[in-house]
């Protein structure tokens, strides 16, 4: 059986969440994906997803968030970045594989940012004045907003998440449309 | 061409210290994990510990854990084995590898460290 | 941790014979309908190759008749027929959980 489980993560405004989503299989290299919160009461709701297909080393950016699917180690790269207070809340990662019901990438995540600059490593005080150049074509996210709650009761594997400082200057205004932007060197 | 490559196998007395470097090429290791594994003479396969080097995030077998460090420096997209308090039962070619399937894949050639006194 | 346990611990065989490689875990190794089981080939001097990873799926570039089977604790490695350079040493190792960890290994020699 299914063990569903949360791993609980608690970091300050201003760091990074980074997540490694282990997708185990190769025949899940090129679907969909997809990076949701749970709010109680509601269905998983999507906060940004990679292209469809989903490309090899393809950054994807929505707002804060960073996907980055990297085909050749069968993993998922999940960033937010300058973490608010009101990010807390419980995430999950899913493959998009219609017709058929998508399913989670690993156990769910349990955020919880507090206020307060830790002054840790791993964080980044000055994130909020980090300016990146949008390039200007978009594309709009092609992904749904909402999910099934059949998708809580399907899944593959495992993730690890830490504070990181952010790999590149970003814009953190609100987007939402999906940017492509420059691999993160 | 994906490639790893141990360095900095010695031979070292008991109680010493040993860094070991695992060089890779071909890809940048921030965006997968890097895993250590070594191999005792004429042994099995132990599983040390890995590392995410996007965020330094680590985990360790225990029966290394507080001994061994492993780390990360992306700018030279190098990992590290820091091994301290060495004893002879750490004798082994040690093992860089890197990930793929849940699993470990792209090994290097393994380097030897030997502890004796 | 799991402690995964190989049988049997050499097997002698020919070329051209099937080979049947057992792997025991003290618990499952499944979890999100996916069975975290591998198994690695190692040649003496060489570091080892992955065969067989998540149970059923072959590594990037290993011939066809190395196949895997299984589920939960139970797992089987296959060499449909033997080619000269497939007498090695042969290990499982599960995934699911911290600290991974290897079987003892399977030395398949020629008979």
């Known amino acids: 059986a299914t063990k569903l489980t949360e791993e609980k993560y608690e970091l300050k405004e201003g760091q990074t969440l980074d997540v490694k989503c282990d997708y185990t299989l190769e025949k899940f290299a090129s679907s969909q994906k997809a990076w949701q919160i749970i709010r109680d009461g509601e269905m998983p709701k999507t906060l940004a997803c990679t292209e469809r297909p989903s490309k090899n080393s393809h950054p994807v950016q929505v707002g804060r968030i960073i996907l980055e699917d990297y085909h050749d180690h069968g993993l998922l790269r999940v960033r937010m970045v300058n973490l608010q207070v009101e990010d807390s809340g419980l995430y999950q990662c899913v493959i998009y594989q219609p017709p058929k019901e998508p399913h989670m990438l690993f156990d769910r995540i349990r955020l919880v940012v507090t206020k307060g600059f830790s002054g840790t490593p791993g964080s980044n005080e000055n994130s909020t004045q980090n300016v990146y150049k949008i390039p200007p074509t978009t594309t709009k996210a092609l992904c749904p907003l909402y999910t099934s709650p059949r998708t809580v009761t399907q899944a593959p594997p495992k993730s690890t998440a830490d504070v990181s400082t952010p790999d590149s200057e970003i814009n953190l205004t609100n987007v939402t449309d999906i940017i492509r932007v420059p691999v993160f060197n | 061409e994906v490639q790893l490559v141990e360095s900095g196998g010695a031979l070292v007395k008991p109680g010493g210290s040993l860094r070991l470097s695992c060089a890779a090429s071909?890809?940048?290791?921030?965006?997968?994990?890097i895993h250590w594994v070594r191999q005792a003479p004429g042994k099995g396969l132990e599983w040390i510990g890995r590392?995410?080097?996007?965020?330094?995030?680590?985990k360790y077998a225990p029966k290394v854990q507080g001994r061994f460090t492993i780390s990360a420096d992306t700018s030279k997209n190098t990992a590290y084995l820091q091994m301290n308090s060495l004893k002879t039962e750490d004798t082994a070619v040690y093992y860089c590898?890197?990930?793929?399937?849940?699993?470990?894949?792209?090994w290097g050639q393994g380097t030897l460290v030997t502890v004796s006194s | 941790e799991i402690v995964l346990t190989q049988s049997p611990a050499t097997l002698s065989l020919s070329p051209g014979e099937r080979a049947t490689l057992s792997c025991r875990a003290s618990?499952?190794?499944?979890?999100?309908?996916?069975?975290?089981m591998n198994w690695f080939q190692q040649k003496p001097g060489q570091a080892p190759r992955l065969l067989i990873y998540a149970a059923s799926n072959q590594g990037s570039g290993i011939p066809a008749r190395f196949s895997g089977s299984g589920s939960g604790t139970d797992f089987t490695l296959t060499i449909s027929s033997l080619e000269p350079e497939d007498f090695a040493v042969y290990f499982c190792q599960q995934s699911k959980e911290v600290p991974w960890t290897f079987g003892q290994g399977t030395k398949v020699e020629i008979k």
């Open positions: 618990e499952s190794v499944d979890n999100y309908g996916i069975s975290f």
């Open positions: 590898t890197g990930h793929y399937g849940s699993t470990m894949d792209y």
């Open positions: 590392i995410d080097p996007a965020n330094g995030n680590t």
């Open positions: 071909g890809f940048n290791i921030k965006n997968t994990y």
